[in-house]
């Protein structure tokens, strides 16, 4: 009888076990194990009759192809053999044992004792059969295995093979190479890889396979496994495969696609091609005269492009366009995409006008192109050039002016300062007393006229100034403040505030400059009660042009000293010019007196102690801050005066032979103007040069309008 | 003409605040300051502080430094002052002044009471 | 800060006598450098807004009537009405402008 055993482990016994076995005996025992395992079988005991090659009793092992082992006996002869210690395995998940006892016994023998268990089966190291083994990497586990890739690799549907993905190559230069994946090496098994050449139309792709060519294929049917396919338009070339690359192919497209598929076996090296597009020549690009052509080549053909550029100096000319290159490239048709264009002198047009200033030809027929040569001048004395530059400007190669400090800026002329067109009396009376100024003596001087109509009733004033530049007149802060019935500073409303400067005489105003004003300035900290900081800028609405009569006065270099004692300077002004008429008596009566013609006055500078001094002597607050300065003569008869408020007191530079605005008439003491030991005082200038720079916004050429020591 | 018209008068609760106003009209509105002034019942004048508003600059009288908020509304030439944390000290007529007090308000009774 | 102070406090006088007041300051008002004393007298009557009557200690506001003039210089001032008229009647006051502003107690001008 058989009997069926589907455990993974168990024992099986001779019947009547361990009596003797019954004589005719049969019994057959199936083993059967889950895919995966195989059977492991050995025995304890094993005492059979003896026989010549177990013909009487034996154990038959065998599967359903194969006879494993036939047992007999009770040790091992030539004839006949026992298990002894050896193990049976299956080699798959079944295993049948047969037990068979013929009729006859001569003894007794206790039969068998034997033992089988599952055991698993290592996939991995004992698959021979490429069909079944894994294509890269195999993974061994208790009833089975499983396969996987390696990096950039898919496991195919089979579960084995490795594949890659490759059919998204799409290639758009015009020269490249392309290979099976993986080349040199072994190309993948199961992959179907697609790439595409795809160039713009007008080329024309042609491939050439090289080196090595090694393609799975068959002795009698023409590439059944593995082959690469080329289509180019209508035309389907291949399949390829073997060892014998083709022929170099012209596909005469723009647009080729390359099939490359393999089975799931075999071990071949692949392929590698090189691919180029040619297109339609073009005829070798003129030359331009004073030009070049790059790249410079044997042939042009479609996309080649060329860049066509000039000589120094010279300007690429295409339909009246100037520009410094041009490109032009061969179409498909085999013809050039532009004329080539012409090359043009480089020129520089008409120099732009200075402000200020005049413009010199240097070369013949006042010619502008690349080399010309034109001078930048300033109108003189009034300008000069910023930087003390040549003012020379050559055409350059790129069509601009250039100068070799400036480079293609413009340059700059600014006033002059500080130099009267007439020059300054050596001796000079009072403005006290009356001595009238030429014209264009003083040409910085300004009249500062406020009414202020905010005011009930309106008010009216006037004051001095100094142009410091086309745009800027410096004066002192009590002029410009708002003649409130309080000691609060509030400067007065810039279009109550009436410029004017070139005036000489007041009655006749049809020669002077009038502007009225976009700012007004006044220093912030200045105090009322002791005009410290008595100093201000009104910034004119438009800038003055200058002229004999209208010249600025240069600014100190900003030293804390200020002017050196006993220098002497000069100061002008419309003030009170008549010494009968006290300050007490213009102050109660509404009129406002002036002199006419303007005044000046040669003062000394008073060493600041002696200054001091005479003022802190009288009842009062008449404190001289280190922020002014005193002039006038100890036995009074020359001052300064009511009116006079806000002008220069200038003292010429040495150096530079320059005059310099070292003070601005501020106040005096409580005596009448040019009474002895009364000396005028002034804001110190040189202590606020920074700034003043900083409202007026600090030129380029600082030192032009600012005498440095 | 030029004229200063002042907000209607104002009964407050102690420890309430209260925001007179002062409109300004014939003349231009930046060019000078305001003034604001404090008349107690039978009592003299004391200046509160002045508003410049050309620059929304302000000055205050010490003793009203905590006590009052001087504002401007430049687009409609309205000058403001905020009186905070009332109490029956603060029971006055507050008068506006401008163009250096050549123009005064008619004035404003604050009366404080709970 | 500048204390003010007016005297008398309050006085009464018959329509066309002349009539002076007083105000001194704590401290100086005039300003050296500009030359002015920062001094105003004003008029309050009752029922009414204060009105501007002389400032810069001397000067007459327009449309004051000239019968009101001021003077004084440094800390002592004076308002003078030299012929009084019946709608003098009022409170007049004098406030510095030297340093802030600050009023004085005032003036109760009454007629006989």
């Known amino acids: 009888h058989t009997v069926e055993l589907n455990n993974m482990f168990g024992q099986i016994q001779s019947p009547g076990y361990p009596d003797s076995y019954p004589s005719d005996s049969e019994v057959t025992w199936n083993i059967t194990v889950p895919e995966g395992f195989r059977i492991k079988l050995y025995f304890m005991h094993f005492n059979l009759e003896s026989s010549y090659l177990c013909e009487y009793d034996y154990v038959k092992v065998e599967t359903e192809e194969q006879v494993l082992a036939t047992f007999c006996g009770r040790e091992t002869t030539d004839t006949e053999q026992t298990p002894g210690q050896e193990v049976v395995f299956s080699p798959g998940s079944f295993m049948s044992i047969t037990f068979r006892s013929d009729f006859s016994n001569e003894e007794r023998f206790t039969g068998f004792d034997a033992h089988y268990m599952a055991v698993d089966v290592d996939e991995c190291t004992e698959r021979e059969d490429e069909e079944l083994s894994c294509d890269h990497y195999c993974h061994n586990y208790i009833g089975g295995y499983y396969c996987s890739c390696r990096f950039g690799y898919l496991l195919h549907t089979d579960n084995r093979t490795c594949r890659v993905e490759c059919s998204d190559n799409v290639y758009t230069q015009r020269t490249g190479v392309i290979t099976s994946p993986d080349f040199p090496n072994p190309y993948p098994k199961s992959s179907e890889c697609f790439y595409t050449i795809e160039l713009e139309e007008g080329f024309m792709v042609s491939l050439q396979f090289e080196d090595i060519f090694d393609i799975e294929d068959h002795p009698e049917v023409p590439c059944p496994y593995d082959y690469i396919k080329i289509k180019a338009g209508p035309k389907v070339l291949g399949p390829f495969c073997g060892e014998k690359a083709p022929e170099p192919i012209n596909t005469e497209s723009h647009s080729v696609q390359i099939l490359f598929r393999s089975d799931n076996s075999g071990e071949n090296q692949g392929w590698r091609l090189s691919y180029r597009a040619t297109g339609n020549e073009c005829p070798d690009p003129e030359l331009p005269v004073h030009g070049k052509i790059e790249p410079l080549q044997a042939t042009y053909s479609f996309k080649d492009q060329v860049l066509i550029s000039c000589d120094t100096g010279y300007k690429v000319l295409k339909d009246n366009v100037e520009m410094d290159t041009f490109q032009i490239e061969c179409l498909k048709d085999g013809t050039w995409s532009n004329r080539i264009p012409t090359c043009k002198i480089a020129d520089c047009g008409a120099p732009a006008e200075l402000k200020h200033g005049l413009i010199t030809f240097s070369t013949r027929n006042n010619l502008t192109t690349y080399k010309s040569e034109i001078q930048y001048s300033c109108q003189q004395p009034y300008y000069k050039m910023l930087h003390n530059i040549t003012g020379v400007y050559t055409c350059s190669a790129q069509g601009v002016w250039m100068n070799e400090v400036l480079g293609r800026s413009q340059p700059t002329c600014l006033p002059v300062c500080g130099q009267p067109s007439r020059s300054l009396p050596n001796l000079v009376k009072r403005i006290i007393g009356g001595r009238n100024a030429e014209p264009g003596l003083f040409p910085w001087q300004a009249l500062i006229v406020v009414e202020d109509t905010s005011r009930v009733p309106n008010d009216k004033w006037f004051g001095s100034g100094a142009l410091l530049s086309e745009s800027w007149i410096l004066t002192a802060a009590h002029v410009l403040r708002s003649q409130r019935r309080d000691n609060t500073v509030t400067p007065v409303s810039k279009e109550h505030v009436t410029v004017y400067l070139g005036l000489h005489d007041v009655r006749d105003k049809s020669g002077a400059v009038n502007s009225s004003a976009a700012q007004v300035v006044l220093h912030p900290d200045f105090n009322i009660q002791n005009y410290n900081h008595d100093i201000a800028l009104v910034q004119l609405r438009e800038p003055v042009p200058l002229g004999p009569h209208v010249m600025p006065i240069c600014l100190p270099s900003p030293e804390p000293e200020g002017p050196e004692p006993h220098m002497l300077g000069l100061v002008a002004g419309w003030g009170i010019s008549n010494p009968n008429v006290t300050v007490d008596e213009i102050i109660s009566s509404g009129t406002r007196t002036l002199s006419d013609v303007l005044q000046y006055v040669k003062l000394p500078v008073v060493p600041y102690a002696e200054c001091k001094t005479s003022y802190e002597s009288r009842s009062g607050n008449y404190s001289v801050t280190e922020n002014m300065f005193c002039a006038g003569y100890y036995e009074g008869g020359k001052d300064t005066c009511l009116g006079d408020s806000g002008g220069a007191f200038v003292i010429l530079d040495d150096l530079s032979q320059r005059w310099v605005a070292q003070g601005l008439v501020s106040w005096g003491g409580p005596e009448e103007c040019g009474s002895k030991q009364v000396y005028g005082v002034y804001t110190k200038v040189s202590n606020y040069v920074d700034w003043l720079w900083e409202q007026m916004g600090s030129p380029q050429g600082l030192g032009d309008l600012q005498v440095e020591r | 003409q030029v004229q200063l018209k002042q907000s209607g008068p104002e009964l407050v609760k102690p420890g309430a605040s209260v925001k007179l106003s002062c409109k300004a009209s014939g003349y231009t509105f930046t060019t000078d300051d305001i003034n604001w002034v404090k008349q107690r019942p039978g009592q003299g004048l004391e200046w509160i502080g002045w508003i410049y508003p050309r620059d929304d600059r302000t000055k205050y009288n010490d003793k009203f430094k905590d006590k009052a908020t001087l504002t401007v509304d430049t687009s409609s030439n309205t000058a403001y002052m905020d009186l905070h944390s009332l109490t029956s000290e603060d029971s006055a007529v507050y008068f506006c002044?401008?163009?250096?007090?050549?123009?005064w308000g008619q004035g404003t009774l604050v009366a404080v009471s709970s | 800060d500048i204390v003010m102070t007016q005297s008398p406090s309050s006085l009464a006088v018959s329509a066309g006598e002349k009539v002076t007041m007083t105000c001194k300051s704590s401290q100086s008002l005039l300003n050296s450098r500009t030359r002015k004393n920062y001094l105003a007298w004003y008029q309050q009557k009752p029922g009414q807004s204060p009105k501007l009557l002389i400032y810069w200690a001397s000067t007459r506001e327009s449309g004051v009537p000239d019968r009101f003039t001021g003077s004084g210089s440094g800390t002592d001032f004076s308002l003078t009405i030299s012929s009084v008229q019946a709608e003098d009647l009022a409170v007049y006051y004098c406030k510095q402008s030297y340093n802030l502003y600050t009023f004085g107690g005032g003036t109760k001008l009454e007629i006989k």
């Open positions: 002044s401008s163009l250096e007090d050549t123009y």
